[in-house]
């Protein structure tokens, strides 16, 4: 029967006795920077060629002993489970792989760096089709490793890498923390995260998403014909790079920012425990469980958006904290949040030609994080408006002004250290979509945008207390571009998106002994693109 | 994921292009910095990344290496350059003691140093 | 349940050998390195020896090299202490603990065995 | 003779806090990472520690690790009577291809 693994990925209409979806990725090429491996395997034979290359350093200790299979066995058994004939989840993919692990299993940033650029240099000279790189590997934060990564990224190529086996931060280690770089977390057969041992994976907001990695059938290098089971965040991102070449085999056009966004928008959503990670990372962790697409055509029409959680700011006073959406991708809205509650809100402001989203910690906070909602909006045109403090009236207001310009954010940003010990705003009033209404002292961001097509409603919850979370989500066929809070009072701790629902986080009353009076409305800003849809619909 | 100003150890050794009358020496005020793995027990010490200016062509890598080689020589070390980047990162890939960072750090087109260190099979 | 039991202590003479052995269960065995450490009465804990989670490496403690022998039978999860030439002051506890992870093997030990007593008494 | 140096015993009131040091070399605390060991009477030890800082699932965080240089800390807040136990810092030593635990320390709670 089927392994636990592959049917987990596989959509329902592709589940027969076996696993055979729709083209195997063979238009693409899938480089394996890890091990030596066992070509000669049944699983991978023809399907792999290994490369010359070679850089790996000394074994450690002096009673080692080189066993070939024992050399071969991580490498060996991650080009199975990308692209083997019986266990792999892209069976059409071809494989080259460049040794730069040791027979330990460890390696070097600088052989991996070399590594890099054998690739780059083999893409130049003998240009094909799309190009998967996957780097099973992980070590500290490295500034050289993740840069690497980016030129490589920025010239077409898609990185997969594993989180990290350390039951740990991924943003500390590399190339984990590269933000061009697809980062993947392992979950096992109860979509659970992998524990192994004390360690297990890793987690927080630089893992984009979780798949498969405990108890992966797939080639042992003991002989042509074995199989083993091996676990890790290695073997979860073998099963996101088999997804990826069959997504680019299918749509060899894709970008990598596009292809991002259709494992995040295909990937299962809300399945994992989150109890298992530390609670200040459960909000930062991405709650996705990979999957291949329903279909290998049609997903043009949607508006995909993806939200990107910043640095912790720091406590210090003026601490801020910047997320910045992919060179590809437009940021659509900004909102912050702060486990404290003590912050000064955010803004949409311009750096290096681009918008980021900067959020400012207060007087006495722990600290805050950006959230920037960044979407993919083909040939779109979009700009921040801003409104300064109103100080006398009700509270302060701004609009999408110019023709053909639609709401799909709101931020709101203040000087004053607390705006709880001000009057809050009123709601919103109805019918004025194109509007976003904050508290007076506060200066009011509204992200307005032109792209052909585009339309945007805004949707509300409110509850008369807080009651520590209110949601709003969009209804199928519109995507959540913009999550903000009315009002933007003490008690309120931030807003953010998730997948398809704004979130806005405060204070239990319980705790903070508010009035009822002081309601919390979560405001989202749902859109889709009609031009996208008509697209999509002449090309079927 | 991570801001490039992320969570790792960092020692900005701040310097001026004083030494050695370099020709080409850094605009004033510009520093080069030396970064290092946070987790000691994965430090590889003795081998480091020399990463230069985004622009910098591979002519002048190789100059860049060359000069820091004669540099050292001049003060009694012996350095290997182990590899030379080009294609994705213009730099070197130099074997030398720690003591030369300081010296490294100052010559031109150099944008940050990082000490090699250990990756693992996950 | 995560669970090592040692085996195969008992009084032995000076010279002669024993072999200890410590059967785990509740894990993926072979996906982790293996520590046997000792503790003589009243006294602190010590290290013996260590072997990677596939065997390809062995370490000792000096005090033991050439002596003692760890191996591991990774079908029956099972890991072994061979002690030969034992002397008086081999007389301990002996605990097989397991590795916090298969490659990180200086991350130290999370799950200890209770101990089988080796006595070595003419 | 153990190559890592810990006090033979520290003491202190329920509530209070107690720290244990750990002396070691470059070759072993300078470059591995730290773990503390908790041996309580008559049963085997138990990881507190991992990494210099991280504790295993199920560890209080009453337990905290630290490093500076070539020296390890241990510290215990909110002394408990069920504390009273030996403690061990461990690493690895590059220099002797070995892993090495410190001498221990034996935390009494005063009544």
């Known amino acids: 029967s089927i392994p636990w693994n592959l049917e987990r990925i596989t959509p329902p209409r592709y589940r027969a006795d076996e696993y055979q979806p729709p083209d195997g990725g063979s238009l693409v090429e899938v480089y394996l920077l890890d091990t030596s491996i066992q070509s000669d395997h049944r699983e991978i034979e023809g399907r792999v060629m290994v490369t010359d290359f070679e850089n790996v350093p000394e074994e450690d200790g002096t009673r080692f002993h080189r066993q070939a299979s024992k050399c071969d066995s991580h490498g060996t058994h991650l080009a199975g489970v990308v692209s083997g004939r019986d266990a792999g989840v892209a069976k059409g993919a071809s494989m080259r792989s460049l040794r730069v692990l040791n027979c330990q299993g460890k390696g070097t940033v600088s052989g991996t760096l070399i590594g890099l650029e054998f690739i780059r240099k083999s893409q130049l000279v003998q240009p094909v089709g799309p190009l998967v790189v996957l780097l099973p590997l992980a070590g500290g934060y490295s500034r050289v490793l993740n840069a690497a990564c980016q030129r490589l990224a920025r010239a077409g190529v898609v990185l997969v890498t594993a989180a990290g086996n350390f039951r740990d931060d991924a943003c500390l280690y590399s190339p984990a923390s590269a933000p061009e770089v697809i980062t993947v977390g392992a979950t096992n057969a109860q979509d659970q995260p992998v524990t192994l041992g004390t360690l297990g994976t890793n987690f927080g907001r630089c893992v984009d998403l979780f798949a498969p990695g405990e108890d992966i059938i797939g080639a042992s290098s003991d002989c042509s014909t074995c199989f083993v089971s091996q676990s890790g965040t290695s073997q979860a991102a073998a099963h996101v790079a088999g997804i990826a070449a069959m997504m680019l085999s299918a749509e060899p056009e894709l970008t990598l920012a596009e292809l991002r966004q259709r494992l995040i928008h295909f990937s299962a959503k809300d399945v994992i425990n989150e109890a298992w990670f530390p609670e200040d990372q459960r909000v930062l962790t991405p709650n996705l469980v990979a999957a291949l697409p329903p279909s290998t055509h049609g997903a043009g029409w949607q508006l995909f958006c993806r939200t990107v959680w910043s640095a912790h700011s720091g406590p210090t006073r003026m601490a801020t904290a910047i997320a910045r959406c992919a060179p590809d991708e437009e940021l659509l809205s900004c909102s912050s949040f702060s486990r404290s509650g003590k912050r000064r809100g955010e803004r949409m402001e311009a750096q290096g030609g681009k918008l980021v989203c900067r959020a400012h910690n207060a007087f006495g906070g722990e600290g805050v994080y950006a959230i920037a909602r960044c979407c993919l909006l083909p040939q779109a045109n979009c700009s921040v408006h801003t409104a300064p403090p109103a100080e006398a009236s009700m509270g302060t207001r701004v609009h999408c002004h110019q023709q053909g310009h639609v709401l799909t954010g709101c931020s709101s940003h203040w000087e004053v250290e607390d705006l709880g010990t001000h009057k809050p705003p009123v709601l919103r009033p109805r019918g004025q979509p194109n509007q976003c209404v904050g508290h007076r002292e506060a200066s009011i961001h509204a992200s307005c945008c032109h792209a052909p097509g585009l339309e945007c409603k805004v949707k509300e919850h409110g509850i008369p207390a807080p009651q520590g979370q209110v949601t709003v989500a969009c209804e199928e066929g519109w995507t959540l571009t913009g999550c903000s809070a009315l009002p933007g009072t003490s008690h309120v701790l931030g807003a953010y998106a998730v997948d398809n629902t704004c979130v806005v986080r405060s204070r239990d009353v319980s705790t903070t002994g508010s009035t009822s009076e002081e309601a919390v409305t979560a405001v989202a800003i749902c859109c889709r693109s009609r031009h996208l849809a008509q697209a999509s619909q002449e090309l079927q | 994921q991570e801001d490039e100003d992320g969570d790792y150890e960092e020692l900005v050794l701040a310097l001026r292009s004083e030494e050695d009358g370099l020709a080409e020496a850094p605009e004033h005020g510009t520093t080069a910095t030396f970064h290092r793995c946070a987790k000691d027990p994965w430090r590889l010490p003795g081998t480091y990344v020399v990463v230069l200016k985004e622009e910098t062509h591979l002519s002048q890598s190789e100059r860049t290496a060359r000069r820091l080689q004669a540099q050292a020589a001049r003060r009694g070390y012996l350095t290997k350059i182990l590899h030379v980047f080009h294609g994705l990162l213009p730099g070197f890939l130099v074997k030398m003691s720690g003591d030369l960072l300081e010296l490294a750090l100052k010559l031109p087109h150099v944008d940050y140093i990082e000490e090699d260190s250990s990756v693992f099979a996950q | 349940q995560v669970h090592l039991v040692e085996s195969g202590g008992g009084v032995v003479q000076p010279g002669r050998s024993l072999r200890l052995s410590c059967a785990a269960s509740g894990f993926t065995f072979n996906s982790f390195g293996m520590h046997w450490v000792r503790q003589a009465p009243g006294k602190g804990l010590e290290w013996v020896a260590l072997?990677?989670?596939?065997?390809?490496?062995?370490y000792y403690a000096d005090s033991v090299k050439g002596r003692f022998t760890i191996s591991r039978d990774n079908s029956k999860n099972t890991l072994y202490l061979q002690m030969n030439s034992l002397r008086a002051e081999d007389t301990a506890v002996y605990y097989c603990?397991?590795?916090?992870?298969?490659?990180?093997?200086?991350?130290?030990?999370?799950?200890w065995g209770q101990g089988t007593t080796v006595t070595v008494s003419s | 003779q153990s190559v890592l140096t810990q006090p033979p015993s520290v003491s202190a009131a329920p509530g209070q806090k107690v720290t244990i040091s750990c002396s070691g070399s470059s070759s072993n605390i300078g470059n591995n990472f730290v773990s503390w060991y908790q041996q309580l009477p008559g049963t085997a030890p138990k990881l507190l520690i991992y990494?210099?800082?991280k504790r295993p699932s199920g560890i209080p965080d009453r337990f905290s690790g630290s490093k500076s240089g070539t020296s390890a800390t241990l510290g215990i807040t909110g002394l408990q009577t069920g504390d009273e136990a030996d403690y061990y810092c461990?690493?690895?030593?590059?220099?002797?291809?070995?892993?090495?635990f410190g001498t221990g320390t034996r935390v009494t709670v005063l009544q």
């Open positions: 990494d210099y800082n």
């Open positions: 072997i990677w989670s596939d065997g390809s490496d062995e």
């Open positions: 603990a397991r590795a916090i992870a298969a490659l990180y093997y200086y991350y130290g030990m999370d799950v």
């Open positions: 461990g690493t690895w030593d590059s220099s002797l291809s070995a892993y090495v």
